[in-house]
Interface confidence: low
């Protein structure tokens, strides 16, 4: 028997520095977690103690903090090289700055293979990107070889900016021939490493003949056997065992997100490459693990540019940006409109001639807007200003919801109106009229939404049975502020870009902004 240790991360999202327990900015260092310096300490400890170790990343290193905003992926290549990652799969967020934003900072600089079997380049891009990412890679480990085959969510064109010269194929269809190829090369230990979410990870384990282990990402799935060490609630045991169609037990793993845990899986193979046993657990990277001093020093050196950036002007406002709780928790506020407009703008994807865009709607809890911005400071808007407005380090995500769920959400928005509570919704691509004289749960008297399948966008009444795409904060997607109906009834959820980054990019693009209060949210009394 031959034993392999797989160390894995996924959805790190730019958390190069240690973070608080909820993966936001570290405040009290003695209680902070994660970060590449601490990760390196643990990885090195395991490499010294165990003979056959692979360090793998399942995608979405890009996007999430000011580190990515400033360094645009160069930080990912630099620190992953420093940690000596063995392989990485491409995630959807690796395309956030277009294909060029992937090729130059990461693909050309990485000293480890970057993988995806289901992304096919065409046209002029094919020769430019050739060899920079691979469908699979055979890695020598000790006196054996291990095949790693990569995959990426086929929804990436809707979630990021891969352009028109990359085709995202069905994962299972694309993986099978690559695994078959590995078998012909006498590689009998094969890991599928990818970024399509836990449901697809399980399907790959079940359907792709020859895959021995699946290491996944995208769904931020936390798996754990036994008593979990922090706040995350396990979605199943670690590893999660799937019996494949050909009767093999295939371990599937994921390691939550944000570099908070290091996935640790021990696999025992027989001489024919069959998995005999698998066990392990994610390791919580808490303050009991010291930060490696050399990596920490490097982080501090790179940090200087970030501090300079946060006070630089992104753009100007010529109007007061009203982000006060007195406005945003009671009525339409222009800060809410600005943020929602930025959220939609960030999701412009012309993937189908029938649609001007795939999504037109935004909702945003008023309680998530934490500060106004005064235009009387020469109109200057900085990253620092935006961090006061959006201090929680969230993301703006894409969900699919039925009209009936949206209606419930808007009823919840005003079910206890007048108490300055955070659930009052700010909107984009939506016109809502409330009648507060009616009883809670029956206060929405008009709800019109902007069409997507149209050449001239216009507002139509919400249809209860129709499925709509909506951009919203991850906080709402997870049922925050009492929006349990969203969490319980959403049909799809894909995590998006860092909230501040979305707004800062929009302001930089527009240069001068002047959002108005324009009748997106109205109140009426009497008949309709």
């Amino acid at each position: 028997a031959w034993e392999l240790t797989i160390l894995h991360t996924n959805d790190v999202h730019s958390r190069l520095e240690q973070t608080s327990e909820d993966s936001s900015k570290c405040v009290n260092a003695s209680r902070c977690m994660g970060g590449v310096a601490r990760l390196f300490t643990k990885v090195q400890q395991i490499r010294r103690a165990e003979p056959n170790v692979l360090l793998l990343d399942a995608g979405d290193q890009y996007q999430g903090t000011i580190w990515f905003t400033v360094y645009k992926g160069a930080e990912v290549a630099h620190f992953m090289n420093a940690l000596r990652y063995d392989a990485m799969a491409l995630g959807n967020h690796e395309f956030d700055n277009g294909v060029e934003g992937l090729i130059e900072p990461l693909l050309k600089e990485a000293k480890f293979p970057i993988l995806s079997a289901n992304i096919k380049a065409k046209g002029p891009l094919a020769s430019q990107i050739s060899g920079l990412y691979l469908p699979y890679k055979v890695l020598p480990v000790g006196d054996e070889v291990v095949g790693i085959v990569g995959y990426t969510s086929k929804e990436t064109p809707f979630l990021s900016n891969p352009g028109t010269n990359l085709v995202f194929e069905d994962e299972i269809t694309a993986l099978q021939p690559e695994v078959d190829k590995l078998k012909t090369l006498n590689v009998n230990k094969i890991i599928a490493l990818g970024h399509s979410g836990f449901e697809m990870d399980k399907l790959i384990a079940q359907k792709v003949r020859g895959v021995d282990v699946v290491v996944g990402g995208h769904s931020n799935t936390f798996l754990y056997t036994g008593n979990p060490p922090s706040k995350e609630v396990p979605a199943g045991k670690y590893p999660f065992i799937v019996t494949s169609d050909d009767g093999r037990k295939v371990p599937v793993v994921q390691a939550y997100a944000f570099g908070k845990y290091l996935g640790y899986l021990k696999i025992e193979f027989d001489e024919r490459g069959n998995v005999i046993s698998s066990h392990g657990n994610p390791i919580l990277l808490n303050s009991s693990i010291p930060e490696d001093p050399s990596i920490k020093a490097d982080i501090n050196k790179w940090r200087i540019k970030l501090d300079n950036y946060s006070t630089q002007e992104l753009g100007k406002t010529i109007v007061y940006l009203d982000g006060s709780s007195q406005s945003c928790r009671f009525r339409e506020c222009n800060m809410g409109n600005l943020i929602c407009d930025a959220m939609i703008n960030n999701n412009l994807r012309h993937t189908d001639e029938m649609f001007w865009n795939h999504v037109s709607m935004c909702i945003l809890n008023g309680g998530g807007i934490r500060s106004p911005i005064d235009e009387r400071n020469n109109g200057t808007i900085t990253w620092e200003n935006l961090a006061a407005v959006l201090p929680f380090g969230g993301t703006f995500d894409l969900v699919q919801l039925k009209g009936s769920t949206l209606k419930k959400a808007f009823e919840h928005s005003v079910h206890r109106y007048g108490q300055s509570t955070g659930e009052f919704l700010q909107v984009g691509g939506i016109h809502v009229v409330y009648d507060l004289s009616r009883k809670p749960g029956d206060r929405v008297v008009k709800l019109d939404v902007l069409c997507t399948k149209c050449r001239v966008p216009s507002y139509d009444p919400l249809k209860m049975d129709e499925v709509y795409k909506v951009i919203l904060p991850n906080f709402l997607a997870n049922g925050g502020d009492g929006f349990q109906m969203i969490k319980d009834e959403l049909l799809r959820h894909d995590s998006g870009d860092q909230d501040i980054n979305v707004v800062s990019t929009y302001i930089s693009k527009m240069k001068v902004i002047y959002p108005a209060v324009e009748g997106r949210i109205k109140f009426s009394t009497g008949s309709h």
Partner: antibody, heavy 120, light 107 residues
Framework: QVQLQQSGAELVRPGTSVKVSCKAS????????IEWIKQRPGQGLEWIGL????????NYIEKFKGKATLTADKSSSTAYMQLSSLTSEDSAVYFC?????????????WGQGTTLTVSS | DIQMTQSPASLAASVGETVTITCRAS??????LAWYQQKQGKSPQLLIY???TLEDGVPSRFSGSGSGTQYSMKINSMQPEDTATYFC?????????FGAGTKLELK
């Protein structure tokens, strides 16, 4: 159509061994797991273990390790369960079942059962 | 090992009546639950898998639901041919374990 045909009833003495067979037909034998289940008269069902006919790999519940031995013959598409050191506690109906190939892995086809009576 | 607690142990129902059988797992089994029907002197037959997916050929009066540790199977109009013993089984973890069974008789 898929069928699992088990060997006939057995009456055996305590301390001896018995080998029960389960012949599969109507599907690719090596693509599915064969599971074995025990049912004592008027009792519930108790999982014994499984065999992967493709690889020969087995998995037993702790209490049946040393009691049951699972094997498979690919050429005849037959799975076998040998029970050793028999006592009256082993008197039961034994079923083989095929584990389905969809996610969740239920037992989609069962043999008709083999009745084992251990008596002196 | 994961324990499966099935209830009731037995019940009698009239034709057309709705019958509900429940199964509680000792820990979360993440929908990995199947229901089987066993008629007198016969081998069990698969009715429902993945907690709520009806096996091909099973009458639509049978349905399954549940999540986490709590699951149930419903027969929404009892028929004479439904007289049998019903077992739940978790397939989330090895060893696979069955409920003790519910004997359903015609009233």
């Amino acid at each position: 159509q898929v069928q699992l045909q088990q060997s006939g009833a057995e009456l055996v003495r305590p301390g001896t061994s018995v080998k029960v067979s389960c012949k599969a037909s109507g599907y690719a034998f090596t693509n599915y797991l064969i599971e074995w289940i025990k049912q004592r008269p008027g009792q519930g069902l108790e999982w014994i273990g499984l065999i992967n006919p493709g690889s020969g790999g087995t998995n037993y519940i702790e209490k049946f390790k040393g009691k049951a031995t699972l094997t498979a013959d690919k050429s005849s598409s037959t799975a076998y369960m040998q029970l050793s050191s028999l006592t009256s506690e082993d008197s039961a109906v034994y079923f083989c079942a095929r584990r389905g190939d969809y996610y969740g892995n239920p037992f989609d086809y069962w043999g008709q059962g083999t009745t084992l009576t251990v008596s002196s | 090992d994961i324990q499966m607690t099935q209830s009731p142990a037995s019940l009698a129902a009239s034709v057309g009546e709705t019958v509900t059988i429940t199964c509680r797992a000792s820990e979360n089994i993440y929908y990995s639950l199947a229901w089987y029907q066993q008629k007198q002197g016969k081998s069990p037959q698969l009715l429902i898998y993945n907690a709520d997916t009806l096996e091909d050929g099973v009458p639509s009066r049978f349905s399954g639901s549940g999540s986490g540790t709590q699951y149930s199977m419903k027969i929404n109009s009892m028929q004479p041919e439904d007289t049998a013993t019903y077992f739940c089984k978790q397939a989330y973890d090895v060893p696979l374990t069955f409920g003790a069974g519910t004997k359903l008789e015609l009233k």
